[in-house]
């Protein structure tokens, strides 16, 4: 489950912030299991960009469909 904060409850994003995401801070090096952490600026929270073959909010699950597809390609 990749839940989001209710944006309506938060103030508008500061005008100075232009990018949609930032690098996560060093404190979040272990936030994503198999992927890269990105800080979503407007939602003001970290998120994970999964490496190929992984899915889930934290890239914690192997993508079985990708595994099957890869093994079929080999055949």
């Amino acid at each position: 489950e990749n839940s989001t904060s209710p944006l309506s409850a938060d103030p508008p994003v500061a005008a100075a912030v232009v990018s949609h995401f930032n690098d996560c801070p060093d404190s979040h090096t272990q936030f994503c299991f198999h992927g890269t952490c990105r800080f979503l600026v407007q939602e003001d929270k970290p998120a994970c960009v999964c490496a190929s073959g992984y899915v889930g909010a934290r890239c914690e699950h192997a993508d079985l469909l990708a595994v099957v597809a890869a093994s079929q390609k080999k055949q």
Epitope: S3, S5, V13, P25, D26, S27, R58
Partner: antibody, heavy 115, light 106 residues
Framework: VQLQQSGAELVRPGASVKLSCTAS????????MHWMKQRPEQGLEWIGR????????KYAPKFQDKATITADTSSNTAYLQLSSLTSEDTAVYYC?????????WGQGTTLTVSS | IQMTQSSSSLSVSLGDRVTITCKAS??????LAWYQQKPGNAPRLLIS???NLKTGVPSRFSGSASGKDYTLSITSLQTEDVATYYC?????????FGGGTKLEIK
């Protein structure tokens, strides 16, 4: 959108206590939750943090044997348990979650350790 | 990561422009917050991300960043601004705080 902490505690030396921090308006699974300590007339110290999504914790070395941080995602609540209490643990304890644009702190829980 | 607030106290007058500085020992990439604390009260978050003013905080407060140096400015000091101000880095754990700068009226 806020963090609501449990009420003040008066406990005996040697006892344990469990403080709570309940989030409203956001899901605690979205990011780490942190705990801080502030002794009377002193600065702020970081105790540790939890990743509520999986229970992974990290502590400052000086609190490793003193504090245990847990979380219950069904109630959107983080907890700080302090054990073997002494007068040195008398302080105000705060929970927090910080972002780039916004940050949230609880109002603090005053813990007094006294016989 | 060490956070150094060079002045532990500042003697100021009402209406003054006040600048409080904080230096990080390494680059923290603007993952910095400023807090105001009055005796007996919880810290009040003023600014996160070095420059983002929290909702409800008066616009006389502002934050800026240059390299490892961070500044909190108050354009025209009011009576209610007399307090201790702390900076905090949250780039990495352990989170660390400056020693605080106490504003005192001349």
């Amino acid at each position: 959108v806020q963090l609501q902490q449990s009420g003040a505690e008066l406990v005996r030396p040697g006892a344990s206590v469990k403080l709570s921090c309940t989030a409203s308006g956001f899901n605690i699974k979205d990011d780490y939750m942190h705990w801080m300590k502030q002794r009377p007339e002193q600065g702020l110290e970081w105790i540790g943090r939890i990743d509520p999504a999986n229970g992974n914790t990290k502590y400052a070395p000086k609190f490793q044997d003193k504090a245990t941080i847990t979380a219950d995602t069904s109630s959107n609540t983080a907890y700080l348990q302090l054990s073997s209490l002494t007068s040195e643990d008398t302080a105000v304890y705060y929970c927090s979650r910080m972002g780039l644009l916004r940050g949230y702190w609880g109002q603090g829980t005053t813990l007094t350790v006294s016989s | 990561i060490q956070m150094t607030q060079s002045s532990s106290s500042l003697s100021v007058s009402l209406g003054d422009r006040v600048t409080i500085t904080c230096k990080a020992s390494v680059h923290i990439n603007s993952w910095l917050a400023w807090y105001q604390q009055k005796p007996g009260n919880a810290p009040r978050l003023l600014i996160s991300g070095a420059t983002n003013l929290k909702t409800g905080v008066p616009s006389r407060f502002s934050g800026s960043a240059s390299g490892k140096d961070y500044t909190l400015s108050i354009t025209s000091l009011q009576t209610e601004d007399v307090a201790t101000y702390y900076c905090q880095q949250y780039w990495d754990t352990p989170w660390t705080f400056g020693g605080g700068t106490k504003l005192e009226i001349k």
